[in-house]
Amino acid sequence: DYKDDDDKAWVWRPFVVLEEMDDIQCVGKLRSDLDNGNNSFQYKLLGIGAGSFSINERTGEICAIQKLDREEKSLYILRAQVIDTTIGKAVETESEFVIRVLDINDNEPKFLDEPYEAIVPEMSPEGTLVIQVTASDADDPSSGNNARLLYSLLQGQPYFSVEPTTGVIRISSKMDRELQDEYWVIIQAKDMIGQPGALSGTTSVLIKLSDVNDNKPIFKESLYRLTVSESAPTGTSIGTIMAYDNDIGENAEMDYSIEEDDSQTFDIITNHETQEGIVILKKKVDFEHQNHYGIRAKVKNHHVPEQLMKYHTEASTTFIKIQVEDVDEPPVFLLPYYILEIPEGKPYGTIVGTVSATDPDRRQSPMRYYLTGSKMFDINDNGTIITTNMLDREVSAWYNLTVTATETYNVQQISSAHVYVQVFNINDNAPEFSQFYETYVCENAESGEIVQIISAIDRDESIEDHHFYFNHSLEDTNNSSFMLTDNQDNTAVILSNRTGFNLKEEPVFYMIILIADNGIPSLTSTNTLTIQVCDCGDSRNTETCANKGLLFIMGFRTE
């Protein structure tokens, strides 16, 4: 029996009651020492939860009248009151007492954090932690084994294991994402540490394997065949090659490259969007030189961590046969341009020179030649250029011709070359006065006075400087009035050889002058210098003579 601290007269044992009982459970009696058994005392029950219990007012016996759930309420704190019915008053102060609800194993373990999902790298070693699952049991952990749990694996062997007491899931066998990329694991939690009568709960865990770069790219074909036209410019894409990689994402990114190309004619670039290798023409090809190529390409992953290099030894390779397709090419002249030379004055039909074009193609088509740029020349089917007229360097020293060659098998195939014809000088022009001289001598001129300075030109080209020789013609007998002196600088001076001239008696003198060049052979011309006598007045200045001559011509006379 129990007496409370106030040393009151209440007497009871500690009260306990089993949860979840369908039948009425009497848990004990309340009794006051003051109760003499004359049935005048009445017992009452007060407090929160008092409705779950009944009390025999006469005997003080307490019974649970409802099924109790410890997990809902494990402790009832009630108040007891005793009343003397004869006086209608409480005979003792209220007293608190406790009814404890005893646990039974009526709750199964529950996984409260569902759904479970974990990601773990493929090929992870045994023992790698994947995830921890935790179940909770609402039963009383301090009451036997009702809430003591054990975890076990219902589905997921042989790849996974679970630690029985912690719920930690670990890898027990390496997994390859490329074979299976996700696994459903079922974990069971049992209470009563798995003993008979235990309750259990299960949960599913979705375990996804993340990719690691454990696969190297491999060519789809061990041999590729591509073709390229010989007219293709450098940089042309001539075809694609492709490898596959069982990995995904960044681990499947690859780089293509040339492993072997003795000719160094091709390159391979990677299209990172399509993961294809594009074969590129690095150098122009020529069907006539080489029309079959073989290159070896390799492919490697872009990102390979050091620890995974073991999966990437010996890159995958493929062989690519490249066939060059012939293109009918235009003729090719032996020289980019021609400079031909011919002396002037040769008769028509003279050979100037020969140009030559060939068909670069295998069939070696014969050529036909055409010439434009001047009617002074013609060309035959051998490419020989001839004159159609006598050439005069002094008319044209250079001719700019265009020769066109066409293949007789395909006249669409045309090429042109410039032909520059230089006409050589021959000394076929005698020197002559460089200008028309209007020469005057004053009536009052003195002997030795300069009448005119003359110079000459020669239409011929001179390799060295021209040198002219001036002479007074020996046949010119009536001109002792004037004298010629060669200055030795391609000029000559005409001097008066007497004092005084008479305009009326001899108004005009004709002086015959010979001019010779220094060509081989030398050429000489006969030139007539007309010297008019002029009334210059006292000044002896011939500047006004031209005007006087003009007036004279027009019928005027000057005083």
Epitope: L223, D262, N291, G294
Partner: antibody, heavy 120, light 107 residues
């Protein structure tokens, strides 16, 4: 392993057309990257390549014979054929069919050859 | 076209000796584009070497190839009785041409 077998008449009259067929076994004529050739060998002489064909029908011929040669392919029968027109005695030879290699244009597989005589 | 010249025309040697066969091209060819064949009487040619030093499947290692540019060599390190026959070189860069052949006979 790929095997090749030539067939066709052993005697052809001058000015007529020589026709030979090569049957491929142990592999498909449509295999990517392989070319199928005809090669001949004049009695007691060296080898002369005639031309080749790819399974798509694209052909390429020796320039010296180009005007007289036609090579065709029949993928359904796994065969390819040679036609050489306007034959003369100079075309008398053993004719071989061959397939090129997986690492180049060399001739890896050969038929056993068939002798064709041009004579009236 | 590229012309191949083989020398010597005939090579007389004894079994066990070393044979060196030469093939010369009329102009430069890449070493990757040359092959060697063996032809026994009444048989089709048989690929020995390509590229120019890779042995074809099933070819004994006594056969080896070398060279570059215009000069190429086939070497048989120790002649076996079955090696006495005709050998051809072939270029496959600019169209396809064969050499005239070298006959290896027993001295």
């Amino acid at each position: 392993q790929v095997q090749l077998q030539e067939s066709g008449p052993g005697l052809v009259k001058p000015s007529q057309t020589l026709s030979l067929t090569c049957t491929v076994s142990g592999g498909s004529i449509s295999s990517s990257g392989y070319y199928w050739s005809w090669i001949r060998q004049h009695p007691g002489k060296g080898l002369e390549w005639i031309g080749y064909i790819y399974y798509t029908g694209s052909a390429y011929y020796n320039p010296s014979l180009k005007s007289r040669v036609t090579i065709s392919v029949d993928t359904s029968k796994n065969q390819f054929s040679l036609k050489l027109s306007s034959v003369t005695a100079a075309d008398t030879a053993v004719y071989y069919c061959a397939r090129d290699g997986s690492s180049g244009w060399y001739f890896q597989y050969w038929g056993q050859g068939t002798l064709v005589t041009v004579s009236s | 076209e590229i012309v191949l010249t083989q020398s010597p025309g005939t090579l007389s040697l004894s079994p066990g000796e070393r044979a060196t066969l030469s093939c010369r091209a009329s102009r430069n060819i890449s070493s990757s584009y040359l092959a060697w064949y063996q032809q026994k009487p009444g048989q089709a040619p048989r690929l020995l070497i390509y590229g120019p030093s890779s042995r074809a499947t099933g070819i004994p290692d006594r056969f080896s190839g070398s060279g570059s540019g215009t000069d190429f060599t086939l070497t048989i390190s120790r002649l076996e009785p079955e090696d006495f026959t005709v050998y051809y070189c072939q270029q496959y860069g600019s169209s396809f041409t064969f050499g005239p052949g070298t006959k290896v006979d027993i001295k």
